[in-house]
């Protein structure tokens, strides 16, 4: 097979015919050294998935349910290109499955038992698989056959296409459960009509259904959405209140050696030449031979799926939970309202050791999961492999953009017993230099810089945000002669100063000696001209407070702070000489786990928090000999957030704006995936 050939998988005679036409037309418009199409015919989409996994084909377009099958081992395929609908300016690649209710009703998601339900049809995504998958563990046992369990859960339903003879309750609201538009309650509009008419109490539909059926806002205001956290929201807040986000139609390929760049090159060229209203002789999104061949007829074009986005992230935690529940039919033994152990995400093996010790001391209430980078940890929390971790503000922003929520804040200044209920203002991000140097904020160009890590608040977002507004470009590696900013491209000058050791050189975790606050300060001590850190870093690592060989003889007076007005001040004066105020680090979790995480952590800090005085013979949660493992070592307590429970409210408008501006310079593959 030529290197530049994409073997498209077709699942019927009609698809094979369209594929051949696709191949011939692409040949006519692409240069001979460009990508080409070859066609492989298989009996079903599942056969196509297997063929791609076995390297007998390269690509196929799948519905969400099949993307799930494609992702499962041993197939291990991943989404590479998404079809979009709507306009090019506002492309829709996902729809949201929602539960709609009338505003004047008073129940929540966890009170659906005994209500009347309206569904689009048996086995359909938004109308059945997702809601029933998410409710699966609340269904009465035995849960098989599923239809019987659902019939016994709701007091009456309309489930078009269900067997009304075997399961009459499923057809109670629409006698016969007709499987076409002859049934007034069939499909999306029908399920909504079932609710509107008062036949049912809840309708499981798409987010767009209510807008398509009620043009008038005043009419829409009579309805609300049920959210998974047992609250309600208005129907236009579907992005924050849905059962699952469902990808519409997606091209998948192998995770390794999958030709994703070639597939994108091919489809991007294809949409240019044969997309909507582009050509008379061949149309990518329609066919005389049948409906939805190779691609959906309703598609308007393609978007490249960001490389960091694997199938788990693409399908989303809720969707995967729903489908897995339905497919595997397994439920936790513990009642669902009981808190299971919280899985903490630890960065590399140093944090993992501390986490293990915590786990032993917590009697198993804490379990540990590891990842090599903060972004990998955030991804694990998103997909349910982990539950929580404490993050610098810069990563609270990324986590928030990825749907996670802040749960508790680290407090550094408030003494107990008021600590747990106090909202601190934050800490100062500072620029530290040696007293012996003549550096100021205005002559940093060409100097050697030390950063905690790319994407972190004091070490990156604040100083680089200020620098960006001065130099108006993102080439920070050209501004400084060299530096250490863990998480930079390995060949960048901002990795040149890092210490490693070798395979971990410039990695954004504790295996890199110059990572984090203490690491950035060490970089200044040993090699650099300026370090961007928190205001407490110098005092915490001088005067013998850090016993490590490189730090034990350091004196506080040998270091000074750079002020934005071009002056310098003592490290004792951060309030009058700082770059900006930074939000305290905070614990983040998935929304569904936030309450459990908060309850457990407040309990854990009562046992292992700063009230423990002898850390040499007791486990201490906020101690790791200046290395800030799991939490900052200067944490006094974890504090409740009260109403600051979203990332925007927690970080504050000013900081969010600063980080949003810096996104032009973003090197965060995760952020790119989460904003897709």
């Amino acid at each position: 097979v030529p290197e530049k050939s994409v073997r498209w998988c077709a699942v019927s005679e009609h698809e094979a015919t369209k594929c051949q036409s696709f191949r011939d037309h692409m040949k006519s418009v692409l240069p001979s050294n460009g990508p080409s199409v070859a066609c492989v015919k298989k009996a079903s989409h599942l056969d196509c998935i297997r063929a791609i996994a076995a390297n007998e084909a390269d690509a196929v377009t799948l519905d969400a349910g099949l993307v799930y099958d494609a992702y499962l081992a041993p197939n291990n395929l991943k989404p590479v290109v998404a079809e979009f609908y709507g306009s090019k300016e506002d492309p829709q690649t996902f729809y949201y499955a929602v539960a709609v209710v009338k505003k004047d009703s008073d129940f929540q998601m966890n009170q659906l038992r005994g209500r009347k339900s309206c569904h689009t049809g048996l086995g359909r995504s938004a109308g059945w698989n997702i809601p029933i998958g998410l409710l699966y563990c609340d269904l009465p046992e035995p849960r098989k056959p599923l239809e019987k369990a659902v019939a016994n859960f709701f007091s009456g339903s309309c489930v078009p296409c269900a067997d009304g003879t075997d399961f009459p309750q499923l057809c109670q609201l629409c006698p016969g459960c007709g499987c076409s538009t002859l049934n007034q309650y069939f499909s999306y509009s029908g399920a909504f009509k079932c609710l509107k008419d008062g036949a049912g109490d809840v309708a499981f539909v798409k987010h767009s259904t209510i807008f398509e059926n009620l043009a008038n806002k005043a009419d829409r205001d009579q309805y609300e959405l049920l959210c998974l956290d047992n609250t309600r929201k208005s129907v236009d807040e579907y992005k924050d209140c849905h059962l699952a986000r469902v990808p519409s139609h997606t091209v998948v390929a192998r995770s390794v050696g999958g030709k994703e760049d070639l597939i994108w090159e091919l489809l991007n060229q294809a949409q240019e030449h044969f997309g909507k209203d582009k050509s008379k002789e061949f149309q990518l999104f329609s066919s005389p031979h049948g409906k939805d061949l190779l691609f959906k007829d309703s598609a308007h074009g393609f978007l490249k799926v960001p490389p960091r986005m694997d199938a788990k992230m693409y399908l989303g935690y809720e969707y995967i939970t729903a489908i897995r529940n339905l497919r595997e039919g397994t439920c936790p033994e513990a009642p669902t309202d009981e808190c299971k152990p919280v899985k903490w995400c630890a960065l590399s093996h140093h944090e993992r050791l501390k986490c293990d010790e915590w786990s032993v001391n917590s009697a198993g209430k804490i379990e540990c999961e590891s990842a090599e980078t903060t972004e990998d940890c955030i991804a694990k929390i998103m997909n349910g492999e982990a539950d929580a971790m404490s993050l610098d503000g810069g990563f609270v922003y990324i986590a928030g953009m990825c749907g996670l929520v802040p749960v508790l804040a680290e407090n550094y200044n408030t003494p107990n017993p008021n600590c747990e209920n106090t909202a601190e203002e934050g800490y100062f991000a500072v620029a530290v230099v040696k007293s012996s140097s003549d550096l100021t904020w205005d002559n940093l160009k060409g100097k050697k810089s030390c950063h905690t890590a790319v994407g972190r608040t004091a070490g990156w977002n604040i100083p680089m945000g200020l620098l960006y507004s001065k130099i108006n470009h993102c080439r920070f590696d050209e501004f400084f002669s060299e530096g250490c900013a863990p998480g930079s491209e390995k060949n960048s000058s901002l990795c040149k100063l890092c210490m490693g050791p070798s395979p971990n050189l410039c990695e954004p975790n504790n295996k890199e000696g110059y990572y984090g606050y203490t690491g950035a300060f060490r970089c200044l001590v040993e090699k650099g001209d300026v370090a961007f850190v928190k205001h407490q870093t110098v005092p915490q690592n001088t005067g013998g407070k850090n016993p490590d060989a490189w730090a034990k003889n350091l004196k506080e007076e040998d270091y000074e702070l750079l002020c934005l007005d071009g002056s310098r001040k003592s490290v004792q004066e951060p309030a009058n000489c700082h770059l900006a105020r930074a939000p305290n680090h905070a614990v983040v979790a998935r929304k569904d786990k936030a309450d459990c995480v908060q309850t457990l952590l407040l309990d854990q800090q009562r046992m292992f928090g700063s009230s423990v005085t002898d850390c040499s013979s007791n486990f201490c949660l906020f101690e790791s000999k200046t290395k800030d493992l799991l939490f900052r070592d200067d944490t006094v307590c974890l504090a409740k957030l009260h109403d600051r429970n979203t990332y925007e409210k927690y970080l504050g408008e000013e900081y969010v704006k600063a980080v949003t501006n810096l996104r032009k310079c973003s090197t965060s593959p995760l952020l790119e995936a989460c904003t897709f």
């Epitope: 944090e351 501390k354 010790e357 032993v360 001391n361 009697a363 504790n510 040499s616 013979s617 493992l629």
Partner: nanobody, 117 residues
Framework: EVQLVECGGGLVQPGGSLRLSCAAS????????MAWYRQAPGQQRELVAG???????KYADSVKGRFTISRDNAKNTLYLQMNSLKPEDTAVYYC???????????WGQGTQVTVSS
């Protein structure tokens, strides 16, 4: 700083038992948490079992019901009783008291456990 030395490993058939010991050079009575880790070739080192001074224990899911951790403060020794051994238990086993901090990559020689027929 207490030095720890592991012993008791060996070759055993699937279904067999072994008892690992970890002798400390000084008193372990003041040490809060002690644990056994293992590392199979090409794998990350993983927690097998841990025990606190008060006797609270924690086990990896893969060894629950088969392994038992205990400590004898009078003898300054940590133990791991391993029953119903499986081939996947093959690894070098290490003990730690976490006292060197989490940052220093100090581990003893460990003791090799091989489960094979």
């Amino acid at each position: 700083e207490v030095q720890l030395v592991e012993c008791g490993g060996g070759l055993v058939q699937p279904g067999g038992s072994l008892r690992l010991s970890c002798a400390a050079s000084g008193s372990i009575a003041g040490i809060n948490t002690m644990a056994w880790y293992r590392q199979a070739p090409g794998q990350q080192r993983e927690l097998v079992a841990g025990i606190t001074r008060s006797g609270s224990t924690k086990y990896a899911d893969s060894v629950k019901g088969r392994f038992t951790i205990s400590r004898d403060n009078a003898k300054n020794t940590l133990y791991l009783q391993m029953n119903s051994l499986k081939p996947e238990d093959t690894a070098v086993y290490y003990c730690t008291d976490y006292s060197r901090g989490y940052y220093q990559d100090y581990w003893g020689q460990g003791t090799q456990v091989t489960v094979s027929s």
